[in-house]
């Protein structure tokens, strides 16, 4: 069961699995249900009674009934980690702790304004985990506002000390706001030879990425496949780091694989959520129960139900044996991963899905889209709703796209003479304009948030974001799509549409049925050749064919130009402006959403 | 029990030559994939040179053109052919088999499948 309140004075007995340091009692729960063994936890407090070396303690613990003796103790906060929860869950910590120096290996010392500067510097640094500022009233006259990048092997500081006049926090990477190059390729027939900072073992290349990724010290990793000549290394990921960041060492060699840590791009791609299922194929490990199940799925549902369940191995029943259920084997590890891969038993391997949530939602693969036709289907795009305004008739004003669970992101051209949010409803999950009724349950918006320096759409920053007053609940048919990673500036996108229920050509009315129109990018060097008359700035993208024939157009804008990339819709564009409909080397314009996702976080996640 | 027998360190000017010879017992040389690393004192674990099972070779920008990695699979034995010595040369090597990196800044912590021999000093003066 679900507890997410903090024990007060009190802490849990026994069932220690290690101790970390944590600035706060909240930040411990955090770290307890990012660490795969972690059910409940015990933060210790400054506090004139505790001994100084105690404060700040994160103790982890596990235990197989899911609960531990509670003993009343000063100072000693305890609590249970999230894992047991089917909230949501971030590993981002924006906050700033004053007079507190958290210790770790200090890399590197350089001047900085303030500490946000600070954050920010340790944000964009491929190695820094956390950092401690100096401010201008540190006693220490050669010290004061220095910004000190530290990195430890967890991730967490080693120490947390108090220290008057200093700041510290974390990198802000887990908060998508990193700008650091996002690398998606796996190299093929390539071994990265630098320092190994940890070794598991995975079904795949791409599970050993995603383990890379949240590992707080892997930069990037090699994979030796179940094909590599070496039996005991196959299905070896080696974690990987080096002083530059990069591989220095690039060797030749087939049935490996390498890549990159998905850090900069965790917030659009799944990275704790390995889905898949392995054939033929058994993964060891501690053994949690054994269970009859009807079929791999099955199998897979009973170990996300059980909070300790970290993977399993199904082996079919034979013939007619036990009502045709077979033996679902729930298993765990001190780290999450198998002790040991084998292939060619029969099994079907995979992992649980409770770590799924601390994904973004985003990253949920949809169902799979009719091709041809310029009609959607329900739940083709969940992400797109219309914007109705009710004054002075209820009508079909705007597209928009649903980014979080309180927020749809617009463009702000809609809202020329909307006086007031209370006007507004936004509809999610409509196919058809013709499903909306007196009855139809909507959203009302509590706010419209215009970017300040948005004057007219040509002009760019066409841009705005609606609060919502209520929150969105997701399904198949109405779920956030992805924003954008900062780091994927340099993707190209092949794979895009335009959605909305606009005009389908420039004298006409508002269509029924939600319309798509698959439509390339065009450079902004080509699109500027297209509209002299205008400035066409990095802030806009361009999309359109040559010849013309397919475009957004009246009433498609503040919808999204959507683009798949592995696998992921992002939000690329927000349709804007363009001269006519679907006209000859016309192409269609839109905001480039990229360059305003610092703005948009800044905007949803304002406390 | 894998072993790997380093041999043929020692002191030489700079500007001089040394052989570096590791014999390996108990595992199939051939298809292993080995390798030089070293270590200097105060530094981490850095690789020098790879020979892979197929013959293909691997060299540290810092030792090109002076260093040459040779096997001879018939006397389970690598080698290290190493020219024109410097002073920043001096380091204990380790000779090492089917391992893609040292652990954690060392050339002796291994991961499954790995393996490190005891290490020879080369000193060069200058």
């Known amino acids: 069961e679900c507890v997410t309140q903090l024990l007060k004075d009190t802490c849990f007995e026994g069932g220690d699995i290690t101790t970390v340091f944590t600035p706060s009692a909240k930040y411990c729960q955090v770290v307890c249900t990012y660490h795969p063994r972690c059910l409940l936890f015990t933060f210790t407090a400054e506090s004139p009674s505790e001994d100084p070396t105690r404060w700040f303690t994160c103790v982890l613990k596990d235990s197989v009934t899911e609960t531990l003796p509670r003993v009343n103790r000063t100072a000693a906060i305890s609590g249970y980690s999230f894992k047991q929860c089917s909230h949501q869950i971030s590993a981002c910590n924006k906050d700033i702790y004053v007079d507190l120096d958290m210790k770790g290996i200090n890399y590197n010392s350089s001047v900085a304004k303030s500490a946000q500067e600070c954050q920010e510097r340790c944000t964009d640094d491929v190695h820094c985990h956390f950092f401690t500022y100096a401010t201008r009233q540190f006693p220490s006259l050669e010290h004061r506002n220095i910004c000190l990048l530290k990195h430890t092997q967890t991730g967490t500081p080693t120490r947390i000390t108090k220290l008057d006049k200093v700041v510290s926090g974390f990198s802000l990477k887990s908060c998508a706001l990193s700008n650091l190059a996002c690398i998606r390729d796996i190299f093929p027939n390539t071994v990265f030879a630098d320092s190994n900072i940890d070794s598991v073992m995975a079904p795949d290349a791409f599970v050993c990425g995603r383990i890379c990724t949240h590992h707080p010290g892997c930069l990037f990793f090699t994979f030796f496949s179940q094909e590599w000549p070496k039996e005991s290394q196959r299905n070896l990921c080696l974690l990987k780091t080096s002083e530059s960041g990069l591989p220095s060492t690039r060797i030749k060699k087939s049935k490996a694989l390498s890549g990159f840590s998905l850090q900069s791009c965790r917030h659009s791609i799944p990275v704790f959520c390995h889905s898949s299922f392995y054939h033929d194929t058994d993964f060891l490990g501690e053994e949690l129960d054994i269970v009859a199940a009807k079929s791999h799925e099955a199998c897979q549902k009973l170990c996300t139900n059980a909070v300790r369940c970290q993977f399993f191995t199904y082996t079919p029943a034979q013939a007619s044996c036990n009502e045709g259920k077979g033996k679902c084997y729930l298993k765990l590890s001190s780290n999450g991963s198998p002790t040991k891969i084998l292939h060619g038993r029969g099994g079907i391997s995979g992992y649980t899905l409770r770590l799924c949530k601390m994904d973004n939602e985003c990253t949920t693969k949809i169902k799979p889209r009719i091709v041809g036709g310029t009609a959607s289907v329900r739940g083709e795009w969940p992400w797109q709703v219309t914007l109705h305004t009710t004054s002075p008739t209820q009508r079909h004003l705007c597209g928009g796209s649903i980014i979080g669970n309180q927020w749809i992101l617009t463009a702000a051209h809609c809202f020329y003479g909307v006086e007031s949010p209370k006007i507004l409803r936004v509809y999610s999950g409509i196919l058809n304009q013709s499903e909306i009724k007196e009855d139809t349950s909507f959203f009302g918006v509590q706010e419209i948030i215009i970017h300040d320096q948005y004057k007219m759409a040509e002009s760019g920053y066409d841009i705005a974001l609606l609060k919502l007053e209520t929150t969105v609940n997701y399904t198949d048919s109405q779920r956030p799509i992805c924003l954008p990673s900062k780091g994927d500036r340099n993707v190209i996108y092949t794979d895009c549409w335009v959605t909305g229920w606009g005009y389908r050509k420039l004298r006409d009315k508002i269509q029924n049925t939600l319309q798509k129109a698959k439509i390339p990018l065009v450079t902004n060097e080509e699109c500027q050749k297209r509209y002299r008359g205008h400035k066409i700035t990095h802030k806009m993208i361009c999309a359109g064919y040559r010849e013309g024939g397919k475009d957004a157009c009246k009433g498609d804008s503040g919808g999204p130009l959507s683009c798949k990339h592995n696998e992921v819709w992002h939000l690329v564009g927000i349709t804007s402006w363009g001269e006519g409909c679907a006209q000859r080397e016309r192409p269609g314009v839109y905001t480039n959403v990229v360059e305003y996702v610092d703005w948009i976080l800044e905007k949803t996640q304002a406390v | 029990q894998v072993q790997l027998v380093e041999s043929g360190g020692g002191s030489v000017q700079a500007g001089g030559s040394l052989r570096l010879s590791c014999t390996a017992s108990?595992?199939?040389?051939?298809?292993?994939?080995m390798a030089w690393y070293r270590q200097a004192p105060g530094n981490e674990c850095e690789l020098v040179s790879t020979?892979?099972?197929?013959?293909?070779?691997y060299y540290a920008d810092s030792v090109k053109g002076r260093f040459t990695i040779s096997r001879d699979n018939s006397k389970n034995t690598m080698y290290l052919q190493m020219n024109s010595l410097r002073a920043e040369d001096t380091a204990v090597y380790y000779c090492?088999?089917?391992?893609?990196?040292?652990?954690?800044?060392?050339?002796?912590?291994?991961?499954?499948?790995?393996?490190w021999g005891q290490g020879t000093l080369v000193t060069v003066s200058s």
């Open positions: 090492a088999a089917d391992q893609w990196g040292s652990a954690e800044g060392d050339c002796t912590s291994s991961y499954p499948g790995g393996y």
């Open positions: 108990e595992f199939t040389f051939d298809d292993s994939d």
């Open positions: 020979i892979t099972s197929d013959g293909g070779t």
